[in-house]
């Protein structure tokens, strides 16, 4: 024998205690699939959520962050707070990276700079809070006589044909 | 930490009302389902109802006697209760919930219950 509730589209329960007919979900519920004996209540995107999609008979809400601050979490679970690049979020706020550290997003934590000379390099530009060194040639590279940089060609006078 | 505490409970005559009541602590109901349970001594746990966002859904049993309502400045919701019987004799549980009704959920909090008596 079918259960009756199988004939029960999204957007509605099966009433158990009337005769098993569909019902529809009440407002901010939702079903998302056919057959169920009950509705799931609609999340609700409030205080530092904002609701990106609104909640439908067949589908939940979805949520994400205000201004400033940025999701977390599977399905937006949580909202953290924004800080500027060049900081991390702390117990007590954002603060600076430390010497030697750096963020370049407004989220997450800071981060050592690149250790240039651990793979044989020198560094080209020094790292900031924002940003990371850059890395360059290996210092053997840049001794006189070393160079593997094919040096530009001379630059030819208008008017004269090659030799 | 939720916490539901019901109230209203008491001896009552035959043919009489209670209203009872289920207050809300570490938490507003505005995201739950609100449902009434009862257990008569020595018997299996029955679903009175379900109140969520302006509806409620009730057990078969109860032949529109019982009314819930909510009162979301109070963030407390009532079970009204008319035309008593001997046999609405029961302690009768608030538990809240992320599914309507609550007819075959378990719910994600339950209050410690309240007793109502109905003889004469």
């Known amino acids: 024998l079918q259960d009756p509730c199988s004939n029960c589209p999204a957007g509605t329960f099966c009433d158990n205690n009337r005769n098993q007919i569909c019902s529809p979900c009440p407002p901010n519920s939702f079903s998302s699939a056919g057959g169920q004996r009950t509705c799931d209540i609609c999340r609700q995107c409030k205080g530092v959520f904002r609701t990106r999609k609104e909640c439908s008979s067949t589908s939940n809400a979805e949520c994400d962050c205000t201004p400033g601050f940025h999701c977390l979490g599977a399905g937006c679970s949580m909202c953290e707070q924004d800080c500027k690049q060049g900081q991390e979020l702390t117990k007590k706020g954002c603060k600076d990276c430390c010497f030697g550290t750096f963020n370049d997003q407004k989220r997450g934590i800071c981060r050592p700079w690149t250790n240039c000379s651990l793979d044989g390099k020198s560094v080209l530009v020094n790292g900031t809070k924002e940003r990371d060194v850059v890395c360059g040639p290996s210092p053997a590279d840049l001794s006189p006589g070393a160079s593997s940089v094919t040096p530009p060609a001379p630059a030819r006078e208008p008017g004269h044909s090659p030799q | 930490e939720v916490q539901l505490l019901e109230s209203g409970g008491g001896l009552v005559q035959p043919g009489g009302s209670l209203r009872l009541s289920c207050a809300a602590s570490g938490r507003t109901f505005d995201n739950y389902a609100v449902g009434w349970f009862r257990q008569a001594p020595g018997k299996e746990r029955e679903y009175v109802g379900t109140?969520?966002?302006?509806?409620?859904h009730y057990g078969d049993f109860e032949n529109n006697r019982f009314t819930i309502s909510r009162d979301n400045s109070k963030n407390t919701v009532y079970l009204q209760m008319n035309s008593l019987r001997a046999e609405d004799t029961a302690v009768y549980y608030c538990?809240?919930?992320?599914?309507?009704?609550?007819?075959?959920?378990?719910?994600?909090?339950q209050g410690q219950g309240t007793l109502v008596t109905v003889s004469s």
């Open positions: 538990a809240i919930s992320l599914k309507y009704p609550m007819a075959t959920v378990t719910p994600d909090y």
């Open positions: 109140y969520w966002s302006g509806y409620a």
